[in-house]
C-alpha cells in the first residue's frame, strides 16, 4: 500500500480535476456499515436529515444508498486507458435529490439537497487500505476523510499512513 | 492492473459448436460491463455479445438464437457458447470488460480488452 504521501500526491490533482460526465458510470444500493458492524441510518427530523451510527435490532431494515460511481478528469500526464485505469469517484445518496455532503469548515458529513451537477463536496474517491473494507476521502480535501466520531459521522484528518487503517476511517459496504 | 485472458478458440467444422471463456484477474471491486467482440481480416471490430452494466445481455442480431452469453461472478469469468457456426463467422474473438478495480488502494476504472482468441470456422 502506498503512504499517505504517495495517497495524496496520487489524489491532489482531483482538486483540479472536474467529473468526464455528468452520467455516473454504474449505480449500486448498498447499505453501509462501520468496521464494527454498527449501520448508518439516516431519519427525517423536521424536515432535514439527520445520519446516525447505531446498533440495530435484530431484524431491523439497514437503510440503503445509492452509490453513483463517477470516472474523473485525469491531468494530461495520465492516459485513463484500460492500462492506467480512470481514477473513479463516488456521491453517496440515502433518498432522493439528498447526497452526503462535505462541510470541510464545520469538519462534518451532512445531507444537502442538491441539484446535478453536483458540487465537489459531495464526491469521494473510494480507497481500500483494509480486507472488505472501504474509506471515503474527499474529493475537495485530499487526505481527509469520512469517518465516526461520537456516533455520528463526521471528516477526520488522516496524517501517516499507519492511520489509513484506522477503524473510525473504515466502513463496509453490503448489498445484501 | 487487471487482465482478460481468452481461452477455448480453434479449428469447427461448418454447423460445429465452440465455448469461449474469458478470465478477469487482479484487484476487482466490481465488474460493470462484460461481453464479447470479433474482427474478421480486413474488418472492423463488432460486437457480438455483452451483458450491459443492468446485467441484461445484449446480442448482435446475426448470432441471435445461436449464441449464449453466461457469467459466473464469483470467478469473475465470461463465456460464450457458440453453436451452428457459420465459415463467415471465423474471426478473432474479443474479450471486453468495464472492471472497477483497486490500484495502490485507490479504486480506478479500466476499460480493459483480452489478447483475442482465433476462431476459425471451416471444412
Known amino acids: 500500500a502506498f503512504g499517505i504521501s504517495g495517497v495524496q500526491k496520487y489524489t491532489r490533482a482531483l482538486h483540479d480535476s472536474s467529473i468526464t460526465g455528468i452520467s455516473p458510470i454504474t449505480e449500486y444500493l448498498a447499505s453501509l456499515s462501520t468496521y464494527n458492524d454498527q449501520s448508518i441510518t439516516f431519519a427525517l427530523e423536521d424536515e432535514s436529515y439527520e445520519i446516525y451510527v447505531e446498533d440495530l435490532k435484530k431484524d431491523e431494515k439497514k437503510d440503503k444508498v445509492l452509490l453513483s460511481y463517477y470516472e474523473s478528469q485525469h491531468p494530461s500526464n495520465e492516459s485513463g486507458d484500460g492500462v492506467d485505469g480512470k481514477m473513479l469517484m463516488v456521491t453517496l445518496s440515502p433518498t432522493k435529490d439528498f447526497w452526503l455532503h462535505a462541510n470541510n469548515k464545520e469538519h462534518s458529513v451532512e445531507l444537502h439537497k442538491c441539484e446535478k451537477p453536483l458540487p465537489d463536496q459531495a464526491f469521494f474517491v473510494l480507497h481500500n487500505m483494509h480486507s472488505n473494507c472501504v474509506s471515503f476521502e474527499c474529493k475537495t480535501d485530499p487526505g481527509v476523510f469520512i469517518g465516526v466520531k461520537d456516533n455520528h459521522l463526521a471528516l477526520i484528518k488522516v496524517d501517516s499512513s499507519e492511520n489509513l487503517c484506522t477503524e473510525n476511517i473504515l466502513f463496509k459496504l453490503s448489498e445484501t | 492492473q487487471v487482465q482478460l485472458v481468452e481461452s477455448g478458440g480453434g479449428l469447427v467444422q461448418p454447423g460445429g459448436s465452440l465455448r469461449l471463456s474469458c478470465a478477469a484477474s487482479?484487484?476487482?471491486?466490481?465488474?460493470?460491463?462484460m461481453g464479447w467482440y470479433r474482427q474478421a481480416p480486413g474488418k472492423q471490430r463488432e460486437l457480438v455479445a455483452s451483458?450491459?452494466?443492468?446485467?441484461?445481455?445484449n446480442y448482435a442480431d446475426s448470432v441471435k438464437g445461436r449464441f449464449t452469453i453466461s457469467r459466473d461472478n464469483a470467478k469473475n469469468t465470461v463465456y460464450l457458447q457458440m453453436n451452428s457456426l457459420r465459415p463467415e463467422e471465423t474471426a478473432v474473438y474479443y474479450c471486453?470488460?468495464?472492471?472497477?478495480?483497486?490500484?495502490?488502494?485507490?479504486?480506478?476504472?479500466?476499460?480493459?480488452w483480452g489478447q483475442g482468441t482465433q476462431v476459425t470456422v471451416s471444412s
Open positions: 471486453n470488460a468495464y472492471i472497477m478495480a483497486w490500484s495502490h488502494g485507490v479504486l480506478k476504472g479500466y476499460d480493459s
Open positions: 487482479g484487484s476487482i471491486f466490481r465488474i460493470n460491463t
Open positions: 451483458f450491459t452494466s443492468g446485467g441484461s445481455p
